[in-house]
C-alpha cells in the first residue's frame, strides 16, 4: 500500500502553532527562566509573536551544527531480546535542554504461529532481529528535530524503538528449548525505559509514548504499565502520556470471511486470540479484569481498552485505515467498487467515528491511508481547519491548564477532531492518492470515481448536484 499515495506540501500552509518549547541557551540545560512582562501586558499576543519570530530566525544558526540522526543503543540487558534472541535496542537523540522525552514504538503487523513467524523471518528479518540494524536513523515527522517539520515537539529527546518482537508489543516470553522465538515486546519497552533513566530520562517532566500501527496498539497496551514502572522506581513526578497512531482497530465483521490462514487474511479477533497464547501476551490489568479467561484479546481493541487507562492518550486514526480494510478483506484493486462494498466502507468510517465519540483527544481524518506521525508531511492534514501538530499542542495545553481534571476544552484550541463527512477523501487535505498501476496522482473526484463511487450517490446526501460537488472537490473545498 506504500506505493499508492504520496504526501505533498500545500501551497498555503497555516501558521505553525506556538512553540511548546524554547531552544535553551548554549550550555544551559534549562527550559524556562523568569521574565518581567509588566511592560508588555497590554499587548502580550504581539509580544509573543515577536519572540517566536526571533526564535525561529535564530534557530537555523544552531541547527547547522545539529546532527539529525538517532544513534543505535543495543540493550545492555541482553536477556531482553528480539524474536531470534538477538538483543533488542533503541535509537536515541538527546536534547539536553529538554525535559520532554518521546519514545516511539515502530509498527509492522505481527505473526501468531510457528509457520507465519518462520515466513516473516525469511521475508522481514529486520522485524525479528537486530543483527542488521543500521547504526543510525534519521528522525522524521514527530521524531524530527527541525521545527519546520515538527512544530510540536522538535526540541524533545527522541527515542525510536524498533519493532522486533512481532507481538504487537505485548509479549512476555523468552526463547527456550520449547519456544523457537522470543516474544518480549512488553519487556523491551520496560527495559528501554529502565536504561533511559540512566541517560537523562530520570529528569523528565513528560514522557510521551507514541507509536504507529502495531506500535499504536502497543501504546494502548503499555502506557499505563510504563507509568506504573516509573512510579515503582521512584519517579512518580514524570507525567506519562500516550499517542496512538493508526492502532485503533475495530473487531468488526469482515467484508468477506476467510479462514485464519495467514496474518493478512485472518480476522483480527482470531489472530490476536491465537497470538496472545503464542506470545504469552500481557494486557493492561484493569482491562484484563473485565474479561473472562481466554478473552483478553478484547484488550487489543482501542475502544475496549481505552476506558480502562489512567494515562491521557491522544488517538490518531484515519477513518478508512488501510490496515483495517486489509484485515476486513477489502482490497481496492482499481476495479469499480460494487455498492455492497461502498456501503461497507462508509459504514466502517461511521463505526470508527462512533468509537471515538468519548475520546476527548482524537484526530480522525476521513482519508484512506495508514500511519501519519513519522511522515515528513504529517503537518499537512487538517480536520476542521486544525492540523495534527496544532491539536497535539492544544492537548498539551489542556493537560497543563486543567491539571488533568477538567473536561472543558480550551477556546480556539480544539483536541477532539473527527471528520464527519462520510466517504474516503472527502477531506480535501487528505494525502494525495496515486493510481497504483499508472502511478499518476489523482484528485479526490478522480479517486472517488475510480473507486466506483457514483457522483450522484455521493452528492445527494450533501444536497448538491454532482457538478457542484465535483467543482468543490476539485477546488479543495
Amino acid at each position: 500500500s506504500e506505493g499508492r499515495k504520496t504526501w505533498r506540501r500545500r501551497g498555503q500552509q497555516p501558521p505553525p502553532p506556538p512553540r511548546t518549547e524554547a531552544a535553551p541557551a548554549a550550555g544551559q540545560p534549562v527550559e524556562s527562566f523568569p521574565l518581567d512582562f509588566t511592560a508588555v501586558e497590554g499587548n502580550m499576543d504581539s509580544f509573543m509573536a515577536q519572540v517566536k519570530s526571533l526564535a525561529q530566525s535564530l534557530y537555523p544558526c544552531s541547527a547547522q551544527q545539529l546532527n539529525e540522526d538517532l544513534r543505535l543503543h543495543l540493550l545492555l540487558n541482553t536477556s531482553v531480546t528480539c524474536n531470534d534472541g538477538s538483543p533488542a535496542g533503541y535509537y536515541l537523540k538527546e536534547s539536553r535542554g529538554s525535559r520532554r522525552w518521546l519514545l516511539f514504538l515502530e509498527g509492522g503487523w505481527y505473526c501468531f504461529n510457528r509457520e507465519n513467524c518462520d515466513s516473516r523471518y525469511d521475508t522481514m528479518r529486520r522485524l525479528m532481529s537486530s543483527r542488521d540494524w543500521p547504526r543510525t536513523r534519521t528522525g522524521t515527522g514527530i521524531l524530527s528535530s527541525q521545527p519546520e517539520e515538527n512544530p510540536y515537539w522538535w526540541n524533545a529527546n527522541m527515542v525510536f524503538i524498533p519493532y522486533c518482537s512481532s507481538d504487537v508489543w505485548s509479549g512476555a516470553s523468552s526463547k527456550s528449548e520449547k519456544n523457537e522465538y522470543a516474544f518480549m515486546g512488553a519487556l523491551i519497552i520496560q527495559e528501554v525505559v529502565r536504561e533511559l533513566l540512566g541517560r537523562g530520562l530520570s529528569g523528565a517532566k513528560v514522557l510521551l509514548l507514541a507509536g504507529s500501527s502495531a506500535g499504536g496498539t502497543g501504546v494502548l497496551l503499555n502506557v499505563d504499565r510504563v507509568a506504573e514502572q516509573l512510579e515503582k522506581l521512584g519517579y512518580p513526578a514524570i507525567q506519562v502520556r500516550g499517542l496512538a497512531d493508526s492502532g485503533w482497530f475495530l473487531d468488526n465483521k469482515q467484508y468477506r470471511h476467510t479462514d485464519c490462514v495467514d496474518t493478512i487474511t485472518c480476522a483480527p479477533t482470531e489472530a490476536i486470540r491465537r497470538g496472545i497464547r503464542y506470545w504469552n501476551g500481557v494486557v493492561p490489568e484493569r482491562c484484563r479484569r473485565q474479561f473472562q479467561e481466554g478473552e483478553e484479546w478484547n484488550c487489543f481493541f482501542g475502544y475496549k481498552v481505552y476506558p480502562t487507562l489512567r494515562c491521557p492518550v491522544f488517538v490518531v486514526q484515519w477513518l478508512f485505515d488501510e490496515a483495517q480494510l486489509t484485515v476486513d478483506n477489502v482490497h481496492l484493486t482499481g476495479q469499480p467498487v460494487q455498492e455492497g462494498l461502498r456501503l461497507y466502507i462508509q459504514n466502517l468510517g461511521r463505526e470508527l467515528r462512533h468509537t471515538l465519540k468519548d475520546v476527548p483527544a482524537s484526530f480522525a481524518p476521513a482519508c484512506l491511508s495508514h500511519e501519519i506521525i513519522i511522515r515528513s508531511h504529517w503537518t499537512d492534514v487538517q480536520v476542521k481547519g486544525t492540523s495534527l501538530p496544532r491539536a497535539l499542542h492544544c492537548w498539551d495545553r489542556s493537560l497543563h491548564d486543567s491539571h488533568k481534571a477538567s473536561k472543558t476544552p480550551l477556546k480556539g484550541c480544539p483536541v477532539h477532531l473527527v471528520d464527519s463527512c462520510p466517504w474516503p477523501h472527502c477531506n480535501p487535505s487528505c494525502p494525495t492518492v496515486r493510481d497504483q498501476f499508472t502511478g499518476q496522482e489523482m484528485n479526490v473526484a478522480q479517486f472517488l470515481m475510480h473507486m466506483g463511487f457514483d457522483m450522484q450517490t455521493v452528492a445527494q446526501p450533501q444536497g448538491l448536484e454532482p457538478s457542484e460537488l465535483l467543482g468543490m472537490l476539485s477546488n479543495g473545498s
Epitope: E231, R288, A405
Partner: antibody, heavy 120, light 113 residues
Framework: QVQLLQPGSVLVRPGASVKLSCKAS????????MHWVKRRPGQGLEWIGE????????TYNEKFKGKATLTVDTSSSTAYVDLSSLTSEDSAVYSC?????????????WGQGTLVTVSA | DIMMSQSPSSLAVSVGEKVTLSCKSS????????????VAWYQQKPGQSPKVLIY???TRESGVPDRFTGSGSGTDFTLTISSVKAEDLAVYHC?????????FGGGTKLEIK
C-alpha cells in the same frame, strides 16, 4: 503519610439518600484509584466499586449499580459515595480504601469507615 | 463473580500455637503471563479497619511480623501464623483482585483461649 479521613457515623431514614465522604491526604489524590467497601457484621466485606479521581472513570460491582454512585472533588482531595433509596440492608460500615500501586488492588490504606444506620 | 470461601469461620487457639487459615476460590487466581496469584490477606482487629498482611498470595507487606506466611496457588490459599500471640486476636479476610468485581472471603475469626 497516607491518610483517609471519614466521619464516624450517620443516621438516615428509610427511603432517603446519604452522601459519605473520604478526605485523602499525604499523597497525590488524582494518581490512585479510590475504592469503597461495605462491611456488615457477620457478613464479611463487599467491594462496591472504584473511581479514578484524575478523570472520574468508575468501575462498579453490578450488585451496587443503582444503589451507589461514586464521585470525587479533586480540589479538596475528597471522594464520595452516594447511597440512594436506603433500607435496613444498607446499614453497615462504609470504608474508602486505596491500593499500594496504581494497578494492583490489594488495599494498603483504609479509612476508619462511616457507620450508616438506616432507621425510622 | 469469583467466590472466595474461608474456613474455618472461627477458631480458638492458645498463645504459641501454629494456626493455618484456608481460603479457596471458585476459579484460578493465577495469571499465566506473570505467574502471580492475585490474592491478599487482611487482619481486622476489633473496632479497627482491615490491615493488609500478604499480597500476591505470599508477599509479606512491610512491617508485618514474619510469623505470618502466605502460600498456595491457583484456587487454594493458606495463611499460616507460626506462633500465635495475644495481639493476633482478629478476623482474617482473604481477597481476590484478579477479576472484577473484587471479592472477599467470609472471614475467619481467631480467638485466643
Amino acid at each position: 503519610q497516607v491518610q483517609l479521613l471519614q466521619p464516624g457515623s450517620v443516621l438516615v431514614r428509610p427511603g432517603a439518600s446519604v452522601k459519605l465522604s473520604c478526605k485523602a491526604s499525604g499523597y497525590t489524590f488524582t494518581s490512585y484509584w479510590m475504592h469503597w467497601v461495605k462491611r456488615r457484621p457477620g457478613q464479611g466485606l463487599e467491594w462496591i466499586g472504584e473511581i479514578y479521581p484524575n478523570n472520574g472513570r468508575t468501575t462498579y460491582n453490578e450488585k451496587f449499580k443503582g444503589k451507589a454512585t461514586l464521585t470525587v472533588d479533586t480540589s479538596s482531595s475528597t471522594a464520595y459515595v452516594d447511597l440512594s433509596s436506603l433500607t435496613s440492608e444498607d446499614s453497615a460500615v462504609y470504608s474508602c480504601a486505596r491500593g499500594l500501586y496504581y494497578d494492583y488492588d490489594w488495599f494498603a490504606y483504609w479509612g476508619q469507615g462511616t457507620l450508616v444506620t438506616v432507621s425510622a | 463473580d469469583i467466590m472466595m470461601s474461608q474456613s474455618p469461620s472461627s477458631l480458638a487457639v492458645s498463645v504459641g500455637e501454629k494456626v493455618t487459615l484456608s481460603c479457596k476460590s471458585s476459579q484460578s487466581l493465577l495469571y499465566s503471563s506473570n505467574q502471580k496469584n492475585y490474592v491478599a490477606w487482611y487482619q481486622q482487629k476489633p473496632g479497627q479497619s482491615p490491615k493488609v498482611l500478604i499480597y500476591w498470595a505470599s508477599t509479606r507487606e512491610s512491617g508485618v511480623p514474619d510469623r505470618f506466611t502466605g502460600s498456595g496457588s491457583g484456587t487454594d490459599f493458606t495463611l499460616t501464623i507460626s506462633s500465635v500471640k495475644a495481639e493476633d486476636l482478629a478476623v482474617y479476610h482473604c481477597q481476590q483482585y484478579y477479576r472484577y468485581p473484587y471479592t472477599f472471603g467470609g472471614g475467619t475469626k481467631l480467638e485466643i483461649k
